[in-house]
Interface confidence: low
């Protein structure tokens, strides 16, 4: 039975040239963490796996930066970065967990960045 | 329980330069990752520079070719070396690594002349 619940930073939004952090947290569950993979849309950004460590796609690599804890943090952002992310976390024995946060990335200085650096 | 701390902070003159250190205690394993925010008087927390394990680096575009991020795998410590420093890069600069609560206390770096 999966009991945990995924919290995430939600609808997020940020300047062109900026950038953000994707952050998602796992709680309410035992379950043992095995591997996180960040998506965006149907594309893999990142793995961030309990023992091999992190990969990031090179695709992404200028641009994607690991962290702070197991998210995410997007540089230089452009238009067409708006869309949806999701973080998926593997675990066991529960399975998967995932998580939906939303970036719109904005032309004008009047974003506001929802993003919590702290991490939960 | 992993602990981070900072040091190496300071007053230093625009156009300065300053080395921050972080050495991480608690690990079982060497991290995959360290990186380093800041955050000023008044605004939010900043990302500024993480570098992996194997050695790749990235950079905020505001620090990019002045600071330079790199890491001590074996002492599980990971520096900041800034050079050319601004006034605006006054802050509090944090270091963290991978985890859901790893953050330091936090070491102040003032650029004033």
């Known amino acids: 039975m999966m009991t945990g619940t995924i919290e995430t930073t939600g609808n997020i939004s940020a300047e062109k040239g900026g950038s953000i952090i994707l952050q998602c947290h796992l709680s309410s569950t035992t379950a043992q963490v095995t591997q996180v993979n960040w998506e965006q849309q149907d594309q893999l950004l990142a793995i961030c796996n309990a023992d091999l460590g992190w990969h990031i796609s090179p695709s992404f690599k200028d641009r994607v930066a690991p962290g702070p804890g197991l998210g995410l943090t997007l540089q230089s952002l452009t238009v067409n970065d708006t869309g949806e992310y999701f973080c998926i976390y593997h675990t066991y024995p529960d399975g998967t967990y995932t998580g939906r946060i939303f970036l719109e990335v904005l032309e004008s200085s009047v974003a506001e960045h929802g993003a919590r650096f702290q991490i939960p | 329980e992993v602990q981070l701390v900072e040091s190496g902070g300071g007053l230093v003159q625009p156009g300065g330069s300053l080395r921050l250190s972080c050495a991480a205690s608690g690990f079982t394993f060497s991290p995959s990752w360290m990186g380093w925010f800041r955050q000023a008087p008044g605004k939010e927390r900043e990302w500024v520079a993480s570098v992996l394990r194997g050695g790749y680096t990235w950079y905020a575009d505001s620090v990019k070719g002045r600071f330079t991020i790199s890491a001590d795998n074996s002492k599980n410590t990971a520096y900041l070396q800034m050079n050319s420093l601004k006034p605006e890069d006054t802050a509090v600069y944090y270091c963290?690594?991978?985890?859901?609560?790893?953050w330091g206390q936090g070491t102040l770096v003032t650029v004033s002349s």
């Open positions: 963290t690594t991978e985890g859901f609560d790893p």
